[in-house]
Interface confidence: medium
């Protein structure tokens, strides 16, 4: 429970008092103010958002609220040179041309400054040439086009359907198979749920919608220009031939209605089994080219985009702390959206707005955290994690020496179905403890917690009776904290039904259908969600920045590292011989797992005991408790991926969205059967199970009695 | 976006050089402003720029004379250059700093060195 | 520091003509921070083509600018009277920005 007893107050202000005071109907109201224009990175419109909610956090009553800007790379659509693809004949006559925006929805057919689908850091060009269908683009469905079926991309334009991965890796695997320009589209199999009508009669995507989105491949760089260091005034930067994570061939995504118009017409190969064939009714025929009749036609895109170096704009709120004002908790979200961001990001942005008024409800009443609560509204998130990467990088100094934890808070809603969370282990039972006191929203399980409506409808796969929380992966503002600097990090939204949508994300993702009217019909009238959601952060947020004693539990990460290490064991046991060959042994970090539990475990019963009147004991338990997260982190990154530093969590280097657990010793033995030089491959894993062991041993040493 | 010099158009030999730049339409604490000079007939220099942060840059050649400084709340920027001599008569122009470019320039005021 | 060297330092050419102008850069500069300035006399410069091709607000669309690496050009499709002025270029490679010597376009 709470504690309030270092920070002078009366009893009432609680986390009660806090949760109490978080409104549905706030949250609606913040939704609908922030969704009524565009409010893409880099425009006027969302630097006057900016300074709309700079004022209003001042209103609420924080310390401070400051504007921090950065010189940052966006990419813009040409508003004179439109971006399209065409099927061209012999003569090089454009014989269909896809569309170049999408049919507003109802209601704003007059709003200006709607950016065209694009996929923002494309290339210019003009490539022509036979088509590819590649399926999600995935790195085993290039190794099924490659290696199976033999098939070579290079010098094609490859179409790839959206979905399951990120899609920047799409485009990284497709330049990496020889590709010379990629067409991504929306298909239904996807993006359209059965028994759901489209936008504006249901949630979902019509023929004409399409998914903006960054096709960048930073690994958490931030901006292109200034790996390392924020783009502030004075910042060196590089030139566009040297920036990180840029693609170097032409990209642009489209709807299933132009997608059609192209799938439909492709010859080659048949697909090589059911899981290529998406709802189109179009064979699937893998290519190269068109079939018989239409051999002669070409496909040609036309890219004209444009990288421009743009001034975006973070705000950055303050409660500062009654007694450890040098302990950091911070609660951000992006501001930045494609179009209108009713879904992404300004349903987390009106939860954090909500959250910021009752804090400050308390504090004009007389209450303050023990620790600082930092708010932030991050920019430019869709165009790579920017702003909060190019802050993280300003202020990296103070926050790997104060920062506690990271709550992320973009989209509250995916879906209505029930939660889902992604965190550090650390936060595993401070997850567990809260759900158990809120209310579940969901229909049926009236006067139960949420932890017992999450576990039944979203049960652990390995622990009964208990929900399932995720890996933390990237694709979002905690990355920087989280995979760069070792602070522990959370973020929670409510989902839709995994097992019977097998769509990816939510159909209108990043199209111009995402709008105020999307949620408020279809997703969540009563804004009962979006609540739960706010009561989820905000109470996670209020126990970080104000318990006593951390709310982290070190004993479970013991437990799953001494899973993960199982899981990347059985996976390169899959290569006994080699193993033997090359002595291959992973004791090292089972020992160092098993020395970790031990430590852990008695750590936490110290913690039990401790006097925890005594302060300076107190912040040195503390202290141990907040470095652990950081004592994962490897200062050299892992290979090829210097801002990828944690050693038990990373990115999927085939997928950002997804956590790959042990990721050093995992990319080692990816594919290690294809590589030219088994010996060096294999010296490789084993240089990774030495890292992996030296730092779960060094992180557990951080938890042993300090003298 | 206005900015406008202001100076004292002739000064001694080996005496120092305040120019005052006065801002509008933008804030000091958003922009950086540099300071560039033209010899009558001649090409423009850059002379140095103090960012928004306070932090500042001189080039080489005069960084031993040159100081920049500033007044947010007064959007002001100030530029003094010690030990003048004849050949740093010039127009002294301000001009708010941009991603490495002057985007916009004030009037510029006129120095003449001379006894 | 990197020194930009423009050409020809007075060029003088009749309405309706197309006018290149070149600046070379003695060591590689990004396109990204290669920029031109208009000068008339007894005025302040203005801001004219910025990141290479970029025409600034309010600069009539006869003219361009391309480049890459140490050469970089700007060109008027059509002269008119009143693009009579020195153009500078200016570059960053890092600190400090240095300008080229101007080229004055005169007109016949």
């Known amino acids: 429970k709470s504690s309030n007893e270092a920070t002078n107050i009366t009893p009432k202000h609680n986390m009660k008092a806090f949760l109490d005071e978080l409104k549905a109907e706030n949250i609606k109201k913040f939704l609908y103010n922030f969704t009524q224009i565009p409010h893409l990175a880099g425009t006027e419109q969302n630097f006057q958002l900016a300074k709309q909610i700079q004022s209003q956090w001042k209103e609420f009553g924080l310390d401070s609220v400051e504007l921090a800007h950065y010189d940052v790379l966006l990419s813009y659509p040409n508003k004179t040179h439109p971006n399209y693809i065409s099927i061209i004949n012999e003569d090089g006559n454009e014989i269909f041309n896809t569309s170049l925006f999408e049919p507003p929805p109802p209601g704003y057919e007059n709003v200006s400054d709607i950016v065209p689908p694009f996929s923002a850091f494309s290339p210019q060009g003009m490539p022509e040439g036979d088509l590819v269908y590649v399926n999600y683009a995935r790195t085993e469905d290039f190794f099924k086009l490659e290696r199976d079926m033999k098939i070579n991309c290079s010098g094609k334009i490859v179409i790839a359907r959206y979905g399951k991965v990120f899609r920047g890796n799409k485009v990284k695997n497709a330049q990496l198979a020889g590709a010379k320009g990629v067409i991504l589209y929306s298909d239904p199999a996807d993006y359209f749920a059965p028994g759901v009508k489209s936008y504006p009669d249901g949630w979902n995507l019509p023929g004409g919608g399409v998914q903006r989105g960054n096709i960048l491949n930073l690994n958490g760089a931030g901006d292109p220009l200034t790996p390392g260091y924020p783009a502030n005034e004075y910042a060196y930067r590089r030139g566009i031939a040297e920036a990180v994570g840029l693609p170097s061939i032409p990209v642009h995504p489209i709807g299933y209605y132009d997608a059609q118009k192209l799938l439909e017409k492709m010859g080659g190969s048949a697909p090589p089994d059911s899981s290529w064939r998406g709802s189109l009714k179009v064979p699937y025929n893998v290519g190269p080219g068109f079939t018989g009749n239409f051999s002669t036609q070409k496909v040609k895109m036309h890219i004209h985009s444009t990288n421009e170096v743009t001034r975006i704009y973070n705000v950055i709120g303050t409660l500062r702390g009654a007694v450890e004002p040098d302990r950091y908790v911070i609660l951000g979200g992006h501001r930045d959206s494609w179009v209108f961001g009713g879904i992404d990001p300004q349903s987390g942005a009106a939860v954090v707005h909500e959250i910021v008024r009752s804090f400050g409800t308390l504090k004009k009443e007389g209450w303050r955290p023990r620790r600082t609560i930092l708010f932030a509204s991050w920019d430019a998130e869709e165009f790579g994690l920017l702003g909060s990467t190019e802050w993280a990088e300003e202020n990296s100094r103070l926050l790997q020496e104060r920062g506690v934890a990271y709550i992320n808070a973009d989209s509250s809603i995916e879906g209505n179905y029930t939660l889902r969370v992604d965190c550090t282990p650390l936060m595993y039972s401070l997850v567990h403890n809260l759900t158990k006191e809120l209310k579940s929203p969901d229909e049926g399980f009236e006067g139960k917690s949420l932890y017992e409506s999450w576990t039944k409808k979203s049960p652990s796969p390995e622990f009964s009776g208990m929900p399932r929380i995720s890996k933390l992966g990237s694709g979002n503002d905690f990355e920087v904290f989280f995979q760069r600097l070792g602070i522990a990090s959370g973020r929670a939204r409510y989902t839709k039904n995994w097992e019977t949508n097998k769509f990816s994300g939510y159909p209108l993702y990043h199209s111009v259908y995402e709008t105020y009217e999307l949620v408020e019909k279809f997703y969540d009238p009563m804004f009962k969600y979006h609540l739960t959601v706010a009561q989820v952060r905000g109470g996670m947020v209020f126990e970080l920045a104000n318990s006593i004693v951390l709310p982290f539990d070190c004993r479970d990460y013991a437990v799953v590292l001494r899973k993960y290490a199982d899981k990347i064991y059985s996976i390169s046991m899959k290569h006994p011989q080699e193993m033997k060959t090359y002595s291959v042994s992973f004791d090292s970090l089972f020992s160092a797992v098993k020395n970790f539990t031990e430590i852990a475990s008695k750590f936490s019963e110290r913690l039990q005991d401790f006097d925890k009147s005594n302060p300076i004991v107190l912040r040195m338990m503390n202290d141990q408790l907040m470095f652990l997260e950081r004592a994962f982190i490897d200062p050299l990154g892992l290979p090829d991926r210097p801002f990828y530093r944690h050693v038990i969590y990373a990115p999927s280097s085939h997928n950002k969205y997804a956590g790959e657990s042990f990721p050093g010793i995992y990319d080692a033995l990816f594919d290690i059967e294809s590589k030219v030089d088994p010996s060096k491959a294999w010296g490789e894993v084993k240089r990774q199970i030495y890292v992996a062991a030296f730092t779960v041993q060094a992180a557990a040493e951080t938890l042993s009695e300090v003298a | 976006v206005k900015l406008q010099e202001s100076g004292p158009g002739l000064v001694a030999p080996s005496q120092s050089l305040s120019i005052t730049c006065t801002v509008s339409?933008?804030?000091?604490?958003?922009?950086?402003v540099s300071w560039i000079r033209q010899p009558p007939g001649k090409g423009l220099e850059w002379l140095g720029v103090i960012w928004s942060d306070g932090n500042t840059y001189y080039n080489s050649p005069l960084k031993s004379r040159l100081s920049i400084n500033k007044d947010n709340s007064k959007s002001q920027v100030f530029l003094k250059m010690n030990s003048l001599q004849t050949d740093d008569s010039a127009m002294y122009y301000c001009a708010r700093h941009k991603v490495y470019t002057m985007d916009y320039w004030g009037q510029g005021t006129s120095v003449t060195v001379s006894s | 520091s990197t020194v930009l060297t423009q050409s020809p330092a007075i060029m003088s050419a009749s309405p309706g003509e197309k006018v290149t102008m070149t600046c070379r850069a003695s060591?590689?500069?990004?396109?990204?921070?290669l920029h031109w300035y208009q000068q008339k006399s007894s005025a302040s410069p203005k801001l004219w083509i910025y990141?290479?091709?970029n025409l600034a607000s309010g600069v009539p669309a006869r003219f361009s600018g391309s480049g890459s690496g140490t050469s970089y050009s700007l060109t008027i499709s059509s002269l008119e009277a009143e693009d009579a002025a020195t153009y500078y270029c200016q570059q960053y490679s890092g600190y400090p920005l240095t300008f080229g010597a101007g080229t004055k376009l005169e007109l016949k």
């Open positions: 060591s590689s500069v990004s396109s990204s921070y």
């Open positions: 990141r290479t091709s």
């Open positions: 339409g933008f804030s000091l604490t958003d922009y950086g």
